[in-house]
């Protein structure tokens, strides 16, 4: 049957839910699915269900809750239909779904070499994702850093920070390093998706070495 | 039984600073969403500013973003408003007020159903 | 921001009257409007939640209703104890507002 995958909001002002369409091998055809939801603004579970607003905007399978449909202030339920009946439900408030878009614009520099020259320190830097209202603390992110040798399979993560820069130490000189940086809402369980890939490639040693004058 | 009652007022020069108080009791600040409205002399309510200290949400009314600042130490049960830069206008009697949107399986509605008994700021030279 | 245009500013009624004040919100806020009620020197207090929820404790002639953007606050017999000042409000945007408040007098 039918079931919610995912309800996101990328910035507490919208979000969308989706749900699996998958038709199982001997199942009866369900027919068409639609999606109501209902504001639960009472203790009283009386409340009108209307249909979702708009199927088409976060593709298929879908529905999407412009800001004119969505309060921070009310929780939500949402249900799945078809032919009638439900095949799934649930409820939720905005401010549990937070899931931001990914940080942007990241960028580093080298902050300081081993004074063997086998080792290299830099900062990296990123900005919130654009939709994110961080000055007027209408959202809080935390941001979590992962990076690893471009020929590892293994991410190496550093603990969660609240800013959007962080030193990165020990890094092998000679060697290209690949940086991602994801972001979620304080105190909420959901990071985001990756921002895209930033490759480091620390100068070779001999950049890093100063001839010393003689006299 | 809940209970919410500010401190901190006073009188205070424009362009000083005041922090009010909201000593919570009853309840845990970290699962609701303290507000803090005002009411001048003679006028009506003036939503201000929210705290949702769990998730560590702020927001504010534009006549005081930039001025003020909302926080909650989690541990003393209390929310606090730091008011800097103030104004004559920002004369009014300030309440804290809980929004407990739903918890512990209940569904509450919308709408304030805690307040505080006010504390008055007068920005007077 | 949304605002809640409440009327009438002030009205003068005797007791055993039937009340009605409105509000009308500039866009759509559901149900997320609450009523108050607040006597002088004192806090307002919660009266109607959810737009005709009515809370714990408040007399039934007290009642709430929606129709679009237009909320009405109805005092359905009017008793000595009602002579205050009422408040609506949303809690729908991002930014709360509230009405300007409606002075219930003793005519």
């Known amino acids: 049957e039918p079931k919610f995958t995912k309800c996101r909001s990328p910035e507490r002002e919208t979000f969308s839910c989706h749900w699996t369409d998958e038709v199982h091998h001997g199942t009866k055809n369900l027919g068409p699915i639609q999606l109501f939801y209902t504001r639960r603004n009472t203790q009283e579970w009386t409340q009108e269900w209307k249909e979702c607003p708009d199927y088409v905007s976060a593709g298929e399978n879908s529905c999407y809750f412009n800001s004119s449909f969505t309060s921070i202030w009310i929780p939500y339920c949402i249900k799945l239909t078809s032919n009638g009946g439900t095949v799934d439900e649930k409820c939720f408030s905005v401010d549990e779904i937070v899931q931001p878009d990914p940080p942007i614009a990241l960028n580093w520099t080298l902050l300081n070499v081993s004074l063997t020259g086998i080792h290299a320190d830099i900062q990296v830097r990123w900005e919130a994702p654009r939709n994110a209202d961080i000055q007027k603390g209408w959202m809080v992110l935390e941001y979590e850093l992962q990076y690893k040798e471009v020929n590892e399979t293994k991410w190496k993560m550093m603990d969660p920070i609240l800013t959007t820069s962080v030193p990165v130490y020990s890094l092998k000189v000679d060697k290209e390093y690949e940086v991602r940086v994801r972001s979620k809402q304080r105190n909420s369980g959901n990071y985001g998706e990756f921002s895209e890939v930033l490759y480091v490639t620390l100068p070779q040693m001999s950049q890093f070495t100063c001839e010393e004058d003689f006299y | 039984e809940v209970q919410l009652v500010e401190s901190g007022g006073g009188l205070v020069q424009p362009g000083g600073s005041l922090r009010l108080s909201c000593a919570a009791s009853?309840?845990?600040?970290?699962?609701?969403?303290i507000h803090w409205v005002r009411q001048a002399p003679g006028k009506g309510l003036e939503w201000v500013a929210y705290?949702?200290?769990?998730?560590?949400?702020?927001s504010y009314a534009d006549s005081v973003k930039g001025r003020f600042t909302i926080s909650a130490d989690t541990s003393k049960n209390t929310a606090y408003l730091q008011m800097n830069s103030l104004r004559a206008e920002d004369t009014a009697v300030y309440y804290c007020?809980?929004?407990?949107?739903?918890?512990?399986?209940?569904?509450f509605g919308v709408g304030f159903d805690y307040w505080g008994q006010g504390t008055l700021v007068t920005v007077s030279s | 921001d949304i605002q809640m245009t409440q009327s009438p500013s002030s009205l003068s009624a005797s007791v055993g009257d039937r009340v009605t004040i409105t509000c009308r919100a500039s866009q759509s806020v559901s149900s997320a409007v609450a009523w108050y009620q607040q006597k002088p020197g004192k806090a307002p207090k919660l009266l109607i939640y959810s737009a005709s929820s009515l809370y714990s404790g408040v007399p039934s002639r007290f009642s709430g209703s929606r129709s679009g953007t237009d909320f009405t606050l109805t005092i359905s017999s009017l008793q000595p104890e009602d002579f205050a000042t009422y408040y609506c409000q949303q809690m729908w945007g991002s930014l709360i507002t509230f009405g300007q408040g409606t002075k219930v007098e003793i005519k």
């Open positions: 705290i949702s200290s769990y998730y560590g949400y702020t």
């Open positions: 009853g309840f845990n600040v970290s699962s609701s969403s």
């Open positions: 007020a809980r929004y407990q949107s739903y918890g512990g399986g209940y569904w």
